[in-house]
């Protein structure tokens, strides 16, 4: 069953390679469990980012080598993406599953277009 | 008709992995609310959920063989795939792929693949 | 895990006779007034048959012999005149969390 996912359509990441964005879905019923994924679409590619299934009301658990954090608030996720460099710039897509308990529901966001722009390097001082 | 065919019989040493397919027909594996689950029954035993795959290719595990077991589809081919590694004797079972509701029943069942872990 | 309990573990009975399996769930399956506890049938060498989905609901082209009851923990799956070809194993599964889980079965035999 379909769900609807909303998120910003731009972010600017921090000189620092951070961005964060809200993934906002619209639950038709109060799941205990639920999977948020970020896909990165560049080129025509779709690549996953990170993935996360929690229990309403605990905390996002990425794997321990991901590059996601989260929290998360009633409906909605606050993701954040670090490590970010020029080269990762493109259209970071939430995808919300709601795994239990049945149904199972799934929502796709249009994507959140991020731009990274690396740091100029600092001038050498004598 | 609706179907789901497996791959045949596999004797496989301790230690080493299994992959068994099941071929949908009658309905595709993109369906929206579609998953194909996979359950696994020992000798003389009861059914034990391993997983299943869903329609956005959404993976879904028991914790109890998370570590071990590999759910994949191609829907091209409306084939879906278990891969079990590290494979010891209680893992001879016969298994199972089945059809899975949106509410998560199983209307449509394999005819099962025998999987016997022997040294 | 929900834990699923069924009993009896086996019975003996004949036909025609009026069959009743019960199946005890560790903490309650339903949500929004569905119970998601379903019943199959499984004969040997064959692979397990839905009869009951969401505690009540017959699975198309099951006979009307069968039925399913129960809310919350405690269910029932009913053989209102046993038939020769309903002598098999029957397990209760519940998909309200995760892992599903099945009950360890009830066999059904000839008395």
């Known amino acids: 069953k379909a769900m609807h996912v909303a998120q910003p359509a731009v972010v600017l990441a921090s000189s620092r390679g951070i961005a964060s964005f809200v993934c906002e879905y619209a639950s038709p019923g109060k799941a205990t469990e639920v999977r948020v994924t970020v896909l990165r679409q560049a080129d025509s590619q779709v690549t996953e980012v990170c993935a996360a299934t929690y229990m309403m009301g605990n905390e996002l658990t990425f794997l321990d080598d991901s590059i996601c954090t989260g929290t998360s608030s009633g409906n909605q996720v606050n993701l954040t993406i670090q490590g970010l460099r020029a080269m990762d710039t493109g259209l970071y897509i939430c995808k919300v599953e709601l795994m239990y308990p049945p149904p199972y529901y799934l929502g796709i966001g249009n994507g959140t277009q991020i731009y990274v722009i690396d740091p100029e390097p600092c001038p050498d001082s004598d | 008709q609706v179907q789901l065919v497996q791959s045949g019989a596999e004797v496989k040493k301790p230690g080493s992995s299994v992959k068994v397919s099941c071929k949908a027909s009658?309905?595709?594996?993109?369906?929206?609310?579609?998953?194909v689950a996979w359950i696994r029954q020992a000798p003389g035993q009861g059914l034990e959920w391993i997983g299943q795959?869903?329609?956005?290719?959404?993976?879904y595990y028991n914790p109890s063989l998370k570590s071990r077991v590999t759910i994949t589809a191609d829907k091209s081919t409306s084939t879906a795939y278990m891969e079990l590694s590290s494979l010891r004797s209680e893992d001879t079972a016969v298994y199972y792929c089945?059809?899975?509701?949106?509410?998560?029943?199983?209307?449509?069942w394999g005819q099962g693949t025998l999987v016997t872990v022997s040294s | 895990d929900i834990q699923l309990t069924q009993s009896p573990s086996s019975l003996s009975a004949s036909v025609g006779d009026r069959v009743t399996i019960t199946c005890r769930a560790s903490?309650?399956?339903?949500?929004?007034?569905?119970?998601?506890l379903d019943w199959y049938q499984q004969k040997p060498g064959k692979a397990p048959k839905l009869l009951i989905y969401?505690?009540?609901s017959l699975e198309s082209g099951v006979p009307s012999r069968f039925s399913g009851s129960g809310s919350g923990t405690d269910f029932t799956l009913t053989i209102s005149s046993l038939q020769p070809e309903d002598f098999a194993t029957y397990y209760c599964?519940?998909?309200?969390?995760?892992?599903?889980?099945f009950g360890q079965g009830t066999k059904v035999e000839i008395k």
């Open positions: 009658g309905f595709s594996l993109s369906t929206g609310g579609v998953a």
């Open positions: 969401d505690a009540s």
């Open positions: 599964q519940q998909s309200y969390r995760s892992p599903i889980t």
């Open positions: 903490e309650s399956v339903d949500f929004q007034g569905i119970s998601f």
């Open positions: 795959i869903y329609y956005s290719g959404s993976t």
């Open positions: 089945a059809r899975s509701s949106a509410h998560y029943y199983f209307d449509v």
